[in-house]
């Protein structure tokens, strides 16, 4: 007897996971036989479509390789033209391991702005996004957050947040991971410590402290009124992101020096600047007690000019007493360059003598000083004309007067030859003949403002200037 | 490199004159910019300077002791001598020798190893 | 007569940064120097014109002098530096003057 199609087997929700199979089964009892029919979203699926089998005269219905976009209500149709056709639906819903869609990337970003790490997900249930970083979970706060679409956060980014990164994508069926990715927090230069700003004798050596930081790590510049230092070592060393930059000058001139931290952040840079002065004390007489030690000269400047088995005073004044004579009596010879033939080598040797003074034998190290008339046989002979010019210089400012009082003795103040022969040097290199004193410029009109005392002549030397003038 | 070295009577009476010399080797006693000086310590004590022979034969000597004290030298030897009377009991000490370099700032950059006297009866 | 005064007795753990001082009017104008003495022998010098080392002694030891107080400092010290460190100088009337001395412990 013919019998109307009854569905026997309701179709049922069915879970299925990607690229897994999934079949739907719908039971029908009628005669004669029903034509079954199926469709997704009340689409027909058709017989010829490959990615489904129909089997059973229909009755079973099986997704070959199930995709994410196979989920949906899926319903069978029975009709055999007795009574009305029947139908059953189910779902199928498509399960899926989380997935991460758009993974982060590394990112490079400024103290103080806002970073965003990417982490776009997919995945059924709904997959929980979490993030690593370094070894350790990351915990959210108020300024790190994770977004619903399971981006990263971090306002305000502070140096500690620099580190290693991967979101973690978890649901009921699996766990994914992103690979690693780099945040680098970059910070504009920051001086942490200024150079200090000193009142020094001329002379002296003095050391220049700059300290910044930033990431990448700063460089540091010298700049000296406005121009890149050209004198003085520079010592720098980095620790710990910090880089201490120390200036050591040797101080003849007052100026500006200033400390430039630059560091460089994609296209653009990051400057910060301390300025520190130096300016130079009006220098004041040795103590009553010399300080210092006793060494053979190991310079250059002097090196004709002083006697080849003396040894040399080195005040301890001075943190590097070699360095700092010879360039003290450096800076006084470049100015002798335009001074006489007759008076160079006169003024040389008085130089070298006066700075690097011999040292007494004695028990304790003492510097013996330039007789005071070999000083005024420079001063008032030699080089009449050039330290009259000199002084009429100095009181006009045009000099740094710090300088000449270091490298030009005070003849008056100088102990004479007459008094005790021992208690002052001679200047063996003053040892003209007669015959030079034609060359010599003529003498100033003015009468030496010394009395230059009679110096008693020598068969040891050739050098005799005058009736009044004999040097030993 | 000089080298110094003391001797003389370990054992000295009181009120007698206590006698060391110091014989210096690798370097001469009238070399410029070298000094020679006396040094004693005391046991248990703190080292005292006693006074010097410069290159040249002048002499200085401690306050607390200028009174007593003597030293003297024989270049032809290459010795320098100390010469301390009226010796007491505190006069026990180690006695070194020393040589004062300016290149040191006359610090005393050689020493003899010491040697000891003691004062008693 | 110059008075020197040095403190009898200064601990420092090993490795650890010693300072022993010398006390004396004005010392800051004059050359001190500083002598290392370990019992049974002779005192050696390790530091001159206040802070020039001589050579053979380590860098560690270095020196400073100033207003009344000269400073004796050892970087790190190490066991064999346990010793009595006396300081030196000169007066302008050509005498010497030591310190009493300061018996460095190295714990």
């Known amino acids: 007897l013919p019998k109307a199609p009854v569905i026997t087997t309701p179709l049922e929700t069915v879970d299925a996971l990607v690229e897994e199979v999934a079949t739907f089964m719908c039971a029908v009892e009628s005669y004669p036989q029903p034509e079954i029919s199926w469709t997704r979203n009340k689409i027909l699926i058709k017989l010829f479509d490959t990615r489904y089998s129909i089997r059973e005269n229909g009755q079973l219905l099986t997704i070959l390789s199930v995709e994410d976009s196979d989920d949906g209500i899926y319903c069978c149709t029975a009709n055999n033209g007795v009574g009305g056709a029947v139908e059953s639906c189910g779902a199928l819903q498509v399960k899926m391991k989380p997935k991460i869609t758009r993974p982060p990337i590394n990112v490079k970003i400024i103290e103080g702005l806002k970073a965003v790490l990417p982490c776009t997900t997919m995945g059924n249930p709904k997959p929980s996004v979490s993030w690593i970083k370094g070894d350790s979970p990351l915990r959210e706060n108020s300024r790190i957050a994770v977004l619903e679409s399971g981006s990263l956060r971090i306002h305000n980014v502070q140096k500690e947040d620099a580190g290693q990164y991967r979101c973690v994508a978890k649901n009921s069926l699996g766990t994914a991971y992103s690979k690693v990715v780099k945040l680098e927090v970059e910070v504009f230069a920051r001086i942490l410590r200024a150079p200090e700003s000193h009142n020094v004798t001329f002379g002296s050596f003095v050391t220049l402290h700059c300290t910044a930081t930033g990431i990448p790590v700063p460089t540091i510049t010298w700049i000296e009124n406005g121009n890149a230092v050209s004198s003085g070592s520079i010592q720098e060393s980095v620790k710990d992101r910090v880089i201490d930059s120390r200036l050591q000058l040797f101080i003849t001139k007052p100026g500006l020096y200033t400390c430039i931290a630059t560091n460089k952040h994609g296209e653009k840079f990051s400057t910060a600047k301390a300025a520190a002065t130096i300016s130079i004390a009006e220098w004041s007489k040795p103590q009553k007690d010399n300080k210092g030690y006793c060494a053979q000269y190991r310079g250059e400047v002097c090196n004709a000019v002083l006697a080849k088995d003396a040894l040399v005073f080195l005040n301890t004044s001075y943190a590097d007493p070699e360095e700092a004579q010879e360039l003290l009596v450096h800076t006084a010879w470049n100015e002798l360059k335009v001074v006489s033939p007759v008076c160079r080598p006169a003024a040389e040797a008085l130089l070298c003598n006066h700075i690097f003074q011999e040292c007494s034998p004695g028990v304790v190290p003492t510097p013996i000083p330039i007789c005071r008339e070999y000083c005024l046989a420079v001063k008032e002979l030699f080089c009449a004309k050039e330290w009259l010019v000199m002084e009429e210089k100095t009181h006009r400012g045009l000099y740094r007067s710090e300088m000449h009082l270091l490298s030009v003795p005070e003849c008056s103040k100088l102990p004479s030859m007459h008094w005790d022969p021992t208690a002052c040097a001679r200047l063996p290199h003053l040892d003209y003949n007669k015959e030079n004193l034609k060359t010599f410029p003529p003498m100033t009109s003015s009468k030496p403002s010394v009395d230059i005392p009679n110096l008693p002549s020598s068969s040891s030397s050739s050098f005799s200037v005058s009736p009044t003038y004999s040097m030993t | 490199q000089v080298q110094v070295q003391e001797s003389g009577p370990g054992l000295v009476k009181p009120s007698q004159t206590l006698s060391l010399t110091c014989t210096v080797s690798?370097?001469?006693?009238?070399?410029?910019?070298?000094?020679w000086s006396w040094i004693r310590q005391p046991p248990g004590k703190g080292l005292e300077w006693m006074g010097v022979?410069?290159?040249?034969?002048?002499?200085y000597y401690s306050p607390s002791l200028k009174s007593r004290t003597s030293i003297s030298r024989d270049t032809s030897k290459n010795q320098f001598s100390l010469h301390l009377s009226s010796v007491t009991p505190d006069d026990t000490a180690v006695y070194y020798c020393?040589?004062?370099?300016?290149?040191?700032?006359?610090?005393?950059?050689?020493w003899g190893q010491g040697t000891q006297v003691t004062v008693s009866s | 007569s110059y008075e020197l005064t040095q403190s009898p007795s200064v601990s420092v753990a090993l490795r650890r940064t010693a300072k022993i001082t010398c006390g004396g009017d004005?010392?800051?104008?004059?050359?001190t120097q500083w002598y290392q003495q370990k019992p049974g022998q002779a005192p050696v010098l390790v530091i001159y014109?206040?802070?020039r080392r001589p050579s053979g002694i380590p860098e560690r030891f270095s020196g400073s002098n100033s207003g009344n107080t000269a400073t004796l400092t050892i970087s790190g010290a190490q066991a064999e530096d346990e010793a009595d460190y006396y300081c030196?100088?000169?007066?302008?009337?050509?005498?010497?003057?030591f310190g009493g001395g300061t018996h460095l412990t190295v714990l």
């Open positions: 020393a040589r004062g370099s300016s290149r040191v700032a006359a610090a005393f950059d050689s």
């Open positions: 690798g370097g001469s006693i009238t070399a410029r910019y070298y000094s």
């Open positions: 022979i410069a290159y040249d034969g002048s002499t």
């Open positions: 004005n010392i800051g104008s004059k050359n």
């Open positions: 014109a206040d802070s």
């Open positions: 030196h100088v000169w007066d302008s009337s050509t005498n010497a003057w």
